[in-house]
Interface confidence: medium
Amino acid sequence: PQIFNKSNDGFTTTRSYGTVCPKDWEFYQARCFFLSTSESSWNESRDFCKGKGSTLAIVNTPEKLKFLQDITDAEKYFIGLIYHREEKRWRWINNSVFNGNVTNQNQNFNCATIGLTKTFDAASCDISYRRICEKNAK
């Protein structure tokens, strides 16, 4: 299945001299990503990232998804994608619409994870998963 709608985004990985991420954060395309080793519900994951001055990751390009999947270590991670039941659509936490494919959809699965599979997977918001946080590189 096609995960993303077709896009002309031809991003490549660049690392500018002097651009840094905090210890244990991963750098990609001027952003820093933190893959937690602990787990919690989606709401607590959102707060966890907020406490680190970041947000749950917005994985809105195929390149970003591939980068993160390459480092997710055979685990599932919450990302900043939630299902708005009243609109019947998935939105990123910055409110942009996600028109791609989410597998494992279920009326009780209103949050999403990546890792383990090559797709975005719907998941219960109340079950504990690891989480990916994202913020600007300095």
Epitope: E39, E75, I127, S128
Partner: antibody, heavy 122, light 112 residues
Framework: QSLEESGGDLVKPGASLTLTCTAS?????????MCWVRQAPGKGLEWIGC???????TYYASWAKGRFTISKTSSTSVTLQMTRLTAADTATYFC????????????????WGPGTLVTVSS | AIVMTQTPSSKSVPVGDTVTINCQAS????????LAWFQQKPGQPPKLLIY???TLASGVPSRFKGSGSGTHFTLTISDVVPDDAATYYC????????????FGGGTEVVVK
């Protein structure tokens, strides 16, 4: 590979105490949890809380929140700080490692220390 | 918080027989059936027997078998030997946002 707890003592009600768990033959892995479990004399096991080594996140049993604090002090030691101790806290305190099994994160405590006895009495 | 209820609290079993210990969770354990079983002998720390419901820990004999899902779990010990005399505990993991782990009350197995 082994774990050893230290710091157990006889203390008075209301006192504070810090227990240390030291690993020998290995360093804590980023993906593992270090946890504390206690056992009152002649009673069952009671889970206290865990620390995720990789990101420092801690979580606790509801009765332990605010009074017990788990911290990582080095790549081979964690502590359990206990405050406002009462006679009900008298127990053997165990530290245990919970590896994050790939793909499921299952909490099987695969390595335990022998325990250290804490007695709270006036 | 999740509550784990073990039955029976004590069981006497002849050498060579099979013993079954039940563990019921007050709510479904977290994903992938995160239920573990431990064996504890007097004066010793617990020893991991089984994790994620049915996976045998390293070095544990295949006489020990874990099964179940959701809220009902079972530990079965077949061909019981004297060395199996111990207290057995189940432990369930519900997730960090719901007070984490909880142990059952224990089942003492006496081998006749």
């Amino acid at each position: 590979q082994s774990l050893e707890e230290s710091g157990g003592d006889l203390v008075k009600p209301g006192a504070s105490l810090t227990l240390t768990c030291t690993a020998s033959g290995f360093s804590f892995s980023r993906s593992s949890y270090m946890c504390w479990v206690r056992q009152a004399p002649g009673k069952g096991l009671e889970w206290i809380g865990c620390l995720s080594v990789g990101d420092g996140h801690t979580y606790y049993a509801s009765w332990a929140k605010g009074r017990f604090t788990i911290s990582k002090t080095s790549s081979t030691s964690v502590t359990l700080q206990m405050t406002r101790l009462t006679a009900a806290d008298t127990a053997t305190y165990f530290c245990a490692r919970a590896p994050s099994y790939s793909g499921d994160g299952g909490h099987g405590y695969d390595l335990w220390g022998p325990g250290t006895l804490v007695t709270v009495s006036s | 918080a999740i509550v784990m209820t073990q039955t029976p609290s004590s069981k006497s079993v002849p050498v060579g027989d099979t013993v079954t210990i039940n563990c019921q969770a007050s709510e479904s354990v977290d994903r992938n059936n995160r239920l573990a079983w431990f064996q504890q002998k007097p004066g010793q720390p617990p020893k991991l027997l089984i994790y994620t419901t049915s996976t045998l820990a390293s070095g544990v004999p295949s006489r020990f078998k874990g099964s179940g899902s959701g809220t009902h779990f079972t530990l079965t010990i077949s061909d019981v030997v004297p060395d199996d005399a111990a207290t057995y505990y189940c432990a369930g993991y519900r997730g960090a946002h719901t007070d984490g782990d909880a142990f059952g009350g224990g089942t003492e197995v006496v081998v006749k």
